[in-house]
């Protein structure tokens, strides 16, 4: 076994002077790592494991079907052939992938974890990391796209299809890199003293990085949406002085606030507990993080199930397309733009622009 010489003292063992060369444990069983992290490695299916697996598989199926429906709807309806919808389709693809990754996890969890090798365990975690990063990166891209359109007073960005493809490629490249980082080296296979409790083959430092990376992304999204909301409020207030329709403006503002609260609220509810738990795993030795881990992972996964609802089901045009697909109805005019084609903008776009412009056809 290759040993790398180091003179760095082992932080987790401060009462001793460590001068050992760390060894690598690529050929060890998963039990070896779990036994050293203090994480329980189940030998049989208990009630909690069965419940988590049952619920997990149900959520997976819903995630895959709901997101597949979003992708199909955007593909079949020409009215959705705009950058925001391509990003929504990509978000759906990321969430679909999250469903697949979680599905793989469900069949390699509980007592089945014992059968995994170091490589397959890292693959299992890598798939989840990749899918969740892609999902979060997409949410951020949508927030940026909304920010650009609102501040340029457009219904849709004038971003070319090529640029959208570049954004999508960047999202997936970033997601794959983030998912692959632990597999290519940022793990504790050669640093056994610094393995985390929650993910026994991952380094403490990676968990902290992963949690902070996602929390920072979340803060950026909050800032972007807060800026959008502040701008729209400013515009509507200015307009209400020169217009006879303050009620409409207030309704528009409330509709926007509602959407933003749903978007951010879902993100906070689904992600924060898991990310905080990762930080507590490293920073709070007395906290029993392992007791909540499964449920918080499930909660984070729920975000992938909720995204189609939040971003798509609030859109009347999208709902109509869903009904057409599910009921196998033929669309009256699925390919060409119609007089009301601009109304296919997301409710977020629609409400912003309704408050900013006197009619929502003024900018395309």
């Amino acid at each position: 076994m290759a040993a790398i010489s180091t003179s760095i003292p082992v932080i987790s063992q401060p009462q001793f002077t460590a001068m050992n060369e760390p060894q690598c444990f690529y050929n060890e069983s998963i039990a070896f790592f779990y036994n050293r992290s203090g994480k329980h490695l189940a030998t049989e299916w208990n009630t909690v494991s069965k419940l988590v697996m049952g619920l997990g598989i149900t959520v997976c199926i819903f995630i895959m079907l709901a997101n597949l429906l979003v992708m199909v709807a955007i593909y079949v309806n020409r009215r959705f052939h705009f950058p925001i919808y391509y990003l929504m389709a990509n978000l759906a693809a990321a969430d679909f992938f999250a469903g697949l990754a979680y599905f793989y996890l469900m069949f390699n969890t509980g007592p089945n974890t014992r059968r995994l090798t170091v490589s397959t365990w890292l693959l299992r975690q890598g798939l989840i990391d990749t899918s969740l990063t892609a999902s979060v990166a997409n949410l951020l891209a949508i927030a940026i796209e909304r920010h650009i359109t609102v501040f340029r007073m457009q219904l849709h960005t004038r971003m070319s299809n090529r640029r959208v493809v570049v954004v999508i490629v960047v999202i997936w490249t970033m997601a794959i890199v983030m998912g692959a980082i632990p597999s290519v080296g940022w793990n504790c296979i050669c640093d056994i003293e610094n393995c985390s409790n929650m993910a026994p083959l991952y380094s403490d430092s990676y968990l902290v990085f992963w949690a902070i990376f996602n929390l920072v992304t979340f803060v950026v999204m909050v800032v972007l949406y807060a800026h959008i909301f502040g701008y729209v409020r400013q515009r509507t207030m200015r307009m209400s002085r020169h217009s006879s329709g303050p009620r409409r403006n207030r309704d528009t503002m409330m509709s926007l606030l509602k959407t933003v609260v749903i978007v951010l609220g879902a993100f906070i509810i689904c992600w924060t507990p898991g990310l905080v738990l990762l930080l507590l795993d490293v920073c709070c030795p007395q906290c029993d993080v392992l007791a909540y881990e499964k449920f918080f992972l499930l909660l984070a996964e729920f975000n992938s199930a909720m995204n189609p609802i939040i971003y798509s089901y609030r859109d009347k045009e999208m709902s109509a397309t869903f009904r057409q697909i599910l009921c196998c109805q033929r669309s009256e005019n699925p390919t060409g733009p119609t007089e009301g084609s601009d109304r296919s903008a997301s409710s977020l776009n629609h409400t912003i622009l309704a408050g900013v412009h006197s009619n929502d056809h003024s900018v395309v």
């Epitope: 063992q13 060894q23 039990a31 036994n35 050293r36 203090g38 994480k39 329980h40 409790n197 007395q286």
Partner: antibody, heavy 122, light 107 residues
Framework: QVQLQQSGAELARPGASVKLSCKAS????????ISWVKQRTGQGLEWIGE????????YYNEKFKGKATLTADKSSSTAYMELRSLTSEDSAVYFC???????????????WGTGTTVTVSS | DIHMTQSPASLSASVGETVTITCRAS??????LAWYQQKQGKSPHLVVY???TLTEGVPSRFSGSGSGTHFSLKINSLQPEDFGIYYC?????????FGAGTKLELK
């Protein structure tokens, strides 16, 4: 300083049960695993099992499964070991020992209790 | 289970001498080996862990070596307080096993 205070000697009848305690002080109890080790008079050391109070996870030597049950009370920073269906073979000194590293299990022990003598006699 | 074989079973030495105790594991345990010293009627005391790392407060005359299956504990210039029984223990993972012990006595 870091200490493990064990309960006093026990005299028990064959078939009976005893519950030994190990009170920890001088450190964060939940951060370190506690193992139990058996030593018969003039004999070597035998590992019984370990409890990790942070999660409540327990690890047992197959030989002692069904014989020993390990528990921990976080509020009183005390680890317990219950021995049941006692026989003369269970007469020994039982030590509790603390893991040398926190937040994970290194499976070596830097702090030991003074030991509890269990005598099984009819 | 991993079986630990210690040798010699007993050893007589004088103050100032150098002694070596060996321990063999039935399978590869990397560097996961600890050495304990136990005096009559007392609790064991951790001397070395990870095969070669000395516990804080242990004099530098003690040194551990080895990896894989063969390990040794060397005590240079024996002092009166060094006499007692020495046990090796693998800390690869459960179930943990100890060697039968080496009794180091004053000649």
């Amino acid at each position: 300083q870091v200490q493990l205070q064990q309960s006093g000697a026990e005299l028990a009848r064959p078939g009976a049960s005893v519950k030994l305690s190990c009170k920890a002080s001088g450190y964060t109890f939940t951060s370190y695993g506690i193992s139990w080790v058996k030593q018969r008079t003039g004999q070597g050391l035998e590992w019984i099992g370990e409890i990790y109070p942070r999660s409540g996870n327990t690890y047992y030597n197959e030989k002692f499964k069904g014989k020993a049950t390990l528990t921990a009370d976080k509020s009183s920073s005390t680890a317990y070991m219950e021995l049941r269906s006692l026989t003369s073979e269970d007469s020994a000194v039982y030590f509790c020992a603390r893991e040398s590293i926190s937040r994970r299990l290194g499976w070596n022990f830097d702090v030991w209790g003074t030991g509890t003598t269990v005598t099984v006699s009819s | 289970d991993i079986h630990m074989t210690q040798s010699p079973a007993s050893l007589s030495a004088s103050v100032g001498e150098t002694v070596t105790i060996t321990c063999r594991a039935s399978e590869n345990i990397y560097s996961f080996l600890a050495w304990y010293q136990q005096k009559q009627g007392k609790s064991p005391h951790l001397v070395v862990y990870n095969a070669k790392t000395l516990t804080e407060g242990v004099p530098s005359r003690f040194s551990g070596s080895g990896s894989g299956t063969h390990f040794s504990l060397k005590i240079n210039s024996l002092q009166p307080e060094d006499f007692g029984i020495y046990y090796c223990q693998h800390h690869y993972g459960p179930p943990l096993t100890f060697g039968a012990g080496t009794k180091l006595e004053l000649k």
